[in-house]
Amino acid sequence: LNTTVLQGMAGQSLRVSCTYDALKHWGRRKAWCRQLGEEGPCQRVVSTHGVWLLAFLKKRNGSTVIADDTLAGTVTITLKNLQAGDAGLYQCQSLRGREAEVLQKVLVEVLEDPLDDQDAGDLWVPEESSSFEGAQVEHSTSRNQETSFPPTS
């Protein structure tokens, strides 16, 4: 499974979009988890609404928000007020009972804002318009890394 690398600026928002086959994953909740080490477990950060029909509603845990468009097959995770400690390897997961299937692996990199200790003046940009939309927005940086992943069957 490929790992998507996303870069975000400290203090701003990073938006991750994980796409999936909506019919294949029918009825499954989605989750965003943080990988603890190379082979370690993936620690749940936030998951979608317990009632699948309400998965479109935003669920928040701290500064992380998740929402799922189950018809379009896109789960969106927003990491607000990005901090250096948010950098690391994450997973978008599809849940069925106790099973968690990896939809996408995401490596989050946090860039220090060069204007952090200076007067930004007219260069200040509202948070919403400076969010990163996965690999789909021009001013975000993303690349793919080939990583091995054991077969599911």
């Epitope: 086959d21 019919l23 294949k24 029918w26 009825g27 499954r28 699948w52 029909l53 009972g97 099973e99």
Partner: antibody, heavy 122, light 107 residues
Framework: EVQLVQSGAEVKKPGESLKISCKGS????????IGWVRQMPGKGLEWMGI????????RYSPSFQGQVTISADKSISTAYLQWSSLKASDTAMYYC???????????????WGQGTMVTVSS | EIVLTQSPATLSLSPGERATLSCRAS??????LAWYQQKPGQAPRLLIY???NRATGIPARFSGSGSGTDFTLTISSLEPEDFAVYYC?????????FGGGTKVEIK
Amino acid sequence: EVQLVQSGAEVKKPGESLKISCKGSGYSFTSYWIGWVRQMPGKGLEWMGIIYPGDSDTRYSPSFQGQVTISADKSISTAYLQWSSLKASDTAMYYCARLGRKPSGSVAFDIWGQGTMVTVSS
Amino acid sequence: EIVLTQSPATLSLSPGERATLSCRASQSVSSYLAWYQQKPGQAPRLLIYDASNRATGIPARFSGSGSGTDFTLTISSLEPEDFAVYYCQQDYSWPYTFGGGTKVEIK
């Protein structure tokens, strides 16, 4: 009409290989999971495994992992169940079934094949 | 894997009587439970999904209830064609296991 049509009955000897089929029609074959269910003579239903023909993602029940292989050819809307070396204990009726989607997010086997009787005897 | 236990194994009743079949899960399956009917020489047929929703074309005399670990299939007034074997199945997590079945026979 939405239906699943299975291949005919088979009589085999122990150690032989076998591949039975299940052809879907009347719906988008690639968009529904297809499951296989075993029913030994006079016994209940056993969930063997399941495949999503769209990408051939497959799941097996622990009891059947390594014993059978489930596959699909989406170009001809057909799912398969195969054995490399049959045993007498494989004698059973085998059903394929479509995992239908319900509005609430649940799924259930809503369309069933007619079954394929496999007899393994020396 | 989740184990489903059905009881009783056999239910002997007369036409017109009420049948109550039980299915118990080894752990919670929420409401992700279905019921199937199988007659001799036939493939199973979906009766109930989501524990309580009747499948298309299923008569109103069939009803399901329960959530978590305890479920019930009720046939309010048995018709001659209802004498068959009934199976519960969970679709909460892989593998989607079946119960052992309850045979409803004519008394």
